[in-house]
């Protein structure tokens, strides 16, 4: 969708007047909420709640609305000009490198680290080293609440170099 051209991407002489109710293409393009007909002569409205288009376009079909997965909440519904906005449920987050699913936030920080950021729908809790204040990015399964090693025993999952 990011590849769609916008009115700003068009040269000034190609820019079309933003008339939403046009039934024919303007300079070869149809307005948001529409797609072009197979003969290129008409603009056809997207179906509310089923598909959408966000930019001026010459697509022969509207884009299918996203359905929120289980584990997600719908922040806003799909309209003819905007896709559904889904967000991870409380206590879960979506990482950039695995956007296909919501993952559970950690419940605490590894030993020797302190929490400086809460769980949000788009990020896990943020932990920093108590002394240096440097962020912890590697995922460590042993969290404060679950460290059971006795004094003098190295806690191998938490053996981090600053």
């Amino acid at each position: 969708e990011s590849a769609l051209i916008t009115q700003q991407d068009l040269a000034p002489q190609q820019r079309a007047a933003p008339q939403q109710k046009r039934s024919s293409p303007s300079e070869g393009l149809c307005p948001p909420g529409h797609h072009i007909s197979e003969d290129g002569r008409d603009c056809i409205s997207c179906k509310y709640g089923q598909d959408y288009s966000t930019h001026w376009n010459d697509l022969l079909f509207c884009l299918r609305c996203t359905r929120c997965d289980s584990g997600e909440v719908e922040l806003s519904p799909c309209t003819t000009t905007r896709n559904t906005v889904c967000q991870c449920e409380e206590g879960t987050f979506r990482e950039e490198d695995s956007p296909e699913m919501c993952r559970k936030c950690r419940t605490g920080c590894p030993r020797g680290m302190v929490k400086v950021g809460d769980c949000t729908p788009w990020s896990d809790i943020e932990c920093v080293h108590k002394e240096s204040g440097t962020k912890h990015s590697g995922e460590v399964p042993a969290v404060e609440e679950t460290v059971t090693s006795s004094p003098g025993t190295p806690a191998s999952p938490c053996s981090l170099s600053g």
Epitope: A3, L4, I5, G28, E38, G40, D58
Partner: antibody, heavy 113, light 110 residues
Framework: SVEESGGRLVTPGTPLTLTCTVS????????MIWVRQAPGEGLEYIGF?????SAYYASWAKGRFTISKTSTTVDLKMTSPTTEDTATYFC???????????WGPGTLVTVSS | DIVMTQTPASVSEPVGGTVTIKCQAS??????LSWYQQKPGQPPKRLIY???TLASGVPSRFKGSGSGTDFTLTIRDLECADAATYYC????????????FGGGTEVVVK
Amino acid sequence: SVEESGGRLVTPGTPLTLTCTVSGFSISRYAMIWVRQAPGEGLEYIGFITSDSSAYYASWAKGRFTISKTSTTVDLKMTSPTTEDTATYFCARYTYSDGTDLWGPGTLVTVSS
Amino acid sequence: DIVMTQTPASVSEPVGGTVTIKCQASQSISTYLSWYQQKPGQPPKRLIYKASTLASGVPSRFKGSGSGTDFTLTIRDLECADAATYYCQPNSGIATYGAAFGGGTEVVVK
């Protein structure tokens, strides 16, 4: 039918305009597309012009080519050709859902110093 | 711009054999894809449009299928005349996404 003309040997930097002449249909009702093919290479989309004369280009072709049309011809202007622009240039009729259905034989452009 | 990835680059089959060419789009184009045949020194010729509709005069040995991002051109009962390079091209949103052709597949008939 569709026929291209204007292809010739030019030196780098010399602007060149290729012309596509159509007969048997009205270009006021069709989009027209320009495609090129370097010797021994594949087809490369340059851009197209809609029935109402709006031109759109492949991202690599913006600024290097200008497409315009009259009532019976479609022009492709090469603004400042380089040796990499040596190719056979095709003009064709484009229909939105049915693809590029009517092609010209092509015209050869050689850019060399 | 949309990117069309075509495989294989070259294929060799005997007369009477079957060739399968695949084309993958970098984003969904529904069924709006065309296939072209090009012989040396000639312009391309449209074989198939809307992914599976045969153009006028094209023998039924040519078959197109697929939708969304994955498409296939199958040529069965190969004839010597089928030796050519084949290209795919998207037909939805060429102002929006561009209309880049696939890289081409050379079909050699033995």
